[in-house]
Amino acid sequence: AQGKEVVLLDFAAAGGELGWLTHPYGKGWDLMQNIMNDMPIYMYSVCNVMSGDQDNWLRTNWVYRGEAERIFIELKFTVRDCNSFPGGASSCKETFNLYYAESDLDYGTNFQKRLFTKIDTIAPDEITVSSDFEARHVKLNVEERSVGPLTRKGFYLAFQDIGACVALLSVRVYYKKCPELLQSLARFPETIAGSDAPSLATVAGTCVDHAVVPPGGEEPRMHCAVDGEWLVPIGQCLCQAGYEKVEDACQACSPGFFKFEVSESPCLECPEHTLPSPEGATSCECEEGFFRAPQDPMSMPCTRPPSAPHYLTAVGMGAKVELRWTPPQDSGGREDIVYSVTCEQCWPESGECGPCESSVRYSEPPHGLTRTSVTVSDLEPHMNYTFTVEARNGVSGLVTSRSFRTASVSINQTEPPKVRLEGRSTTSLSVSWSIPPPQQSRVWKYEVTYRKKGDSNSYNVRRTEGFSVTLDDLAPDTTYLVQVQALTQEGQGAGSKVHEFQTLSPEGSGSLAV
């Protein structure tokens, strides 16, 4: 921000009324009036260029310092070219000297040179040559100097002429203030600029109404430089919840809008499925039946639990069931839908039912499923199973009702046994099998059916209560088709896959495990 100038003395604005002191009296400096741009202007002028040893002083009136620490002196002046005078005026100069003196009282007409301290020699950038003078082109020079720190009640300025042809058209003395400033929603008071060029006065800012320093943020501070400019902003204020930045102020959110935290962001419109908010709202309440999960941002619409899975099928495959379903028709407005599968088994004889989570195996964990299918295995034969698939989302936990669909399935067969070739010779094959333990109690015997490959007219059957059998009297180097089936009280279980096993050729005789 630009520095604010507080004027202590302005000769040009005074219209020749200041009555400055000249020394020696009646010689040297002279107050004169001229016409410029059809306006009368006053100037202090001296032009004793033909006489040597000039020492003409012009002293201002006493200037009250007030709160100023460093003053700035702006001079507007014109200097005639020494060569514009006949013979070059050998004693002519083109500079003058600027002095100041501090005092606690006005000395009036008592002028003492020794009290004055030189500020600088003032030289023009442009001199007025004959043609400019003739054409009344005033070559105006502007020079600025500063003095500080000042400590007394007031001061004088003085101008010493040593033989120049010079006119002072403007003498303006001012000090600088950093103006009152609103920045980053912080108010900084008007501050007097310091006197030492390298130093910067640190000024604390105050947050405007309804603004605060953000958590973990720095308090607002600015630095008032010697030239009255604010520099190096540190920290900031932000509008509190329910308020947004409008120009340099925090304004309450309009009805139907909200802001839930201290931030730079504007108020947001209340999202879908919320009630209209009052002015200055920090949040928007959900409509009845709609909810907000704890992790949901306030800007997200309110949502509700999903409806039940749309379509559920249970396809039995022996002692396995594949459950398939489609997503709910109403997601509740959320994308975080997960499914939970629960299982209940019922004994047909007694009609008694109970949970079966511990006795069945799922192809993936049955809670928090994101896919829409799962396979359940290790089911017991001749048992009724009911599967429940529940759809849940982030707000399901906020209501007591549940959204689910059920499917029932009866297991009539055991699972097909898993068959392995344990060993073979030229005339025998040793075969073993397994079925899930829960089903083993239901099995009475296992039936092994085998025949030569390509011979569809005859086959052999062996029954056993164990889990293995050796098939003898087989032809060497011959492929046999083997299938194992469980036999239960209720009938036959599912048959295994038909396996092809080959006996050894006579050259590679001897028992060999595979």
């Epitope: 004169m32 100037m43 002028s45 004793n48 014109t78 003078f133």
Partner: antibody
Framework: EVQLLESGGGLVQPGGSLRLSCAAS????????MAWVRQAPGKGLEWVSR????????HYADSVKGRFTISRDNSKNTLYLQMNSLRAEDTAVYYC?????????????????????WGQGTLVTVSS | DIQMTQSPSTLSASVGDRVTITCRAS??????LAWYQQKPGKAPKLLIY???NLHTGVPSRFSGSGSGTEFTLTISSLQPDDFATYYC?????????FGQGTKVEIK
């Protein structure tokens, strides 16, 4: 030494014309503002016209505006005053006068000029 | 136009006298005033410019003062060569008007 010598004066009838000349010597003519000042018999001085060092700007007294024309030829070091539509009240001694800013020891030029050097004058009589 | 009024119109004085002639402007002319001396049948001569500045070669018995509307020409000790008519002239405006003149004659 600065010398200004007027010529061209004489008797002329009302409504007639006359051209005055002023020959300059002893100074750099092209540096000077030049002017004509007249003095009616037994009366005071009256400024008539002025011309800048390079030929402009020109100014005229209200009493002669539109009738008199001032000009100069710096190559000939000569100032002229062309007088048309002469009237009886134009009867006067006409002086040519010069001003050199170099001899004006002020920092800022005055709004107009004064006259540092004068010729001896030439008499113009307008009469029927 | 700015009117310049001189007083007195005629002044009788003796050699060695201190003589003061006054010139009044109808409006402020700051210090833009010149004084001339004219002897019968001769051209005027510049004495003072900018109210108080002595022109080159003019004797120091001549001095000028004043500003605004009131100006004076002073001859500190009248000499025989000083009997003449004196004119003031303002050059604060382009009209460059003269006063009507003050004749200084031998008493």
């Amino acid at each position: 030494e600065v010398q200004l010598l007027e010529s061209g004066g004489g008797l002329v009838q009302p409504g007639g014309s006359l051209r005055l000349s002023c020959a300059a010597s002893g100074f750099t003519f092209s540096h000077y503002m030049m002017a004509w000042v007249r003095q009616a018999p037994g009366k005071g001085l009256e400024w008539v016209s002025r011309i800048g060092p390079s030929g402009g700007p020109t100014h005229y007294a209200d009493s002669v505006k539109g009738r008199f024309t001032i000009s100069r030829d710096n190559s000939k070091n000569t100032l002229y005053l062309q007088m048309n539509s002469l009237r009886a009240e134009d009867t006067a001694v006409y002086y040519c006068a010069g001003y050199d800013s170099g001899y004006d020891y002020v920092a800022v030029a005055g709004p107009a000029e004064y006259f540092q050097h004068w010729g001896q004058g030439t008499l113009v009589t307008v009469s029927s | 136009d700015i009117q310049m009024t001189q007083s007195p119109s005629t002044l009788s004085a003796s050699v060695g006298d201190r003589v003061t002639i006054t010139c009044r402007a109808s409006q402020s002319i700051s210090t833009w005033l010149a004084w001339y001396q004219q002897k019968p049948g001769k051209a005027p001569k510049l004495l003072i410019y900018k109210a108080s500045n002595l022109h080159t070669g003019v004797p120091s018995r001549f001095s000028g003062s004043g500003s605004g509307t009131e100006f004076t020409l002073t001859i500190s000790s009248l000499q025989p060569d000083d009997f003449a008519t004196y004119y003031c002239q303002q050059y604060n405006s382009y009209s460059r008007t003269f006063g009507q003149g003050t004749k200084v004659e031998i008493k």
